[in-house]
């Protein structure tokens, strides 16, 4: 089944590489159990960012050497991406699937454009 | 087109053991996850497991976990469901589903195997 999921268009990523937004879905019942995937579109190539699952009202628990943490507050999830370079940039898709109780819904956000721009070196001081 | 076939499905006294089969076919595809649903007469459609083909990253409903294994053969483009320790509860009728990339859903199914635990 459809849900829908919005995310913001547009973000800058900081002078450090880190990025943050929220994906927030539609939620048709009362899900416990929900997945949130994050993936990157550039060059019509789909790269898979980082996975977690949570339960609801927790943290959300993303693999030991992921550059994703978040946490989520009712049907918000707020997703921060660090160590990102100018190369990264691209397109950030949310996917949120609610995974217990049945039934199962997938929703798929439209991205959010990261922009990643690398900070210039300091210049060397004499 | 991608065609995805379930086998493996029957009857089975609960305790016992059943391996589902799901095979695609219809051209070179890599797909970016496989996975397994299955639907109970009368009930919602209900998520399994599946695998995603970056990491072989696996994924199980807590209702099957310890007791179903789901695992895929990239040469064969097949994917399993190992399912043991089996329960009434587990009776449905079970679905393989693809999807091509992270982004596109679920775009392909099966036709379902039917599962049968009895007591």
């Known amino acids: 089944k459809a849900m829908h999921v919005a995310q913001p268009a547009v973000v800058l990523a900081s002078s450090r590489g880190i990025a943050s937004f929220v994906c927030e879905y539609a939620s048709p019942g009362k899900a416990t159990e929900v997945r949130v995937t994050v993936l990157r579109q550039a060059d019509s190539q789909v790269t898979e960012v980082c996975a977690a699952t949570y339960m609801m009202g927790n943290e959300l628990t993303f693999l030991d050497d992921s550059i994703c943490t978040g946490t989520s507050s009712g049907n918000q999830v707020n997703l921060t991406i660090q160590g990102l370079r100018a190369m990264d940039t691209g397109l950030y898709i949310c996917k949120v699937e609610l995974m217990y109780p049945p039934p199962y819904y997938l929703g798929i956000g439209n991205g959010t454009q990261i922009y990643v721009i690398d900070p210039e070196p300091c210049p060397d001081s004499d | 087109e991608v065609q995805l076939v379930e086998s493996g499905g029957g009857v089975v006294q609960a305790g016992g053991s059943l391996r589902l089969s799901c095979a695609a076919s219809g051209g070179t595809f890599s797909f970016y996850g496989m996975g397994w649903f299955r639907q109970a007469p009368g009930k919602e459609q209900e998520f399994v497991a599946d695998?995603?083909?970056?990491?072989?990253?696996?994924y199980y409903a807590d209702s099957v976990k310890g007791r179903f294994t789901i695992s895929r053969d990239n040469a064969k483009n097949t994917v399993y469901l190992q399912m043991n320790s089996l329960k009434p509860e587990d009776t449905a009728l079970y679905y393989c589903?693809?999807?091509?990339?992270?982004?596109?859903?679920?775009?392909?199914w099966g036709q379902g195997t039917q599962v049968t635990v009895s007591s």
């Open positions: 589903a693809a999807e091509m990339s992270g982004i596109s859903g679920w775009d392909y």
């Open positions: 695998i995603r083909t970056s990491a072989g990253r696996t």
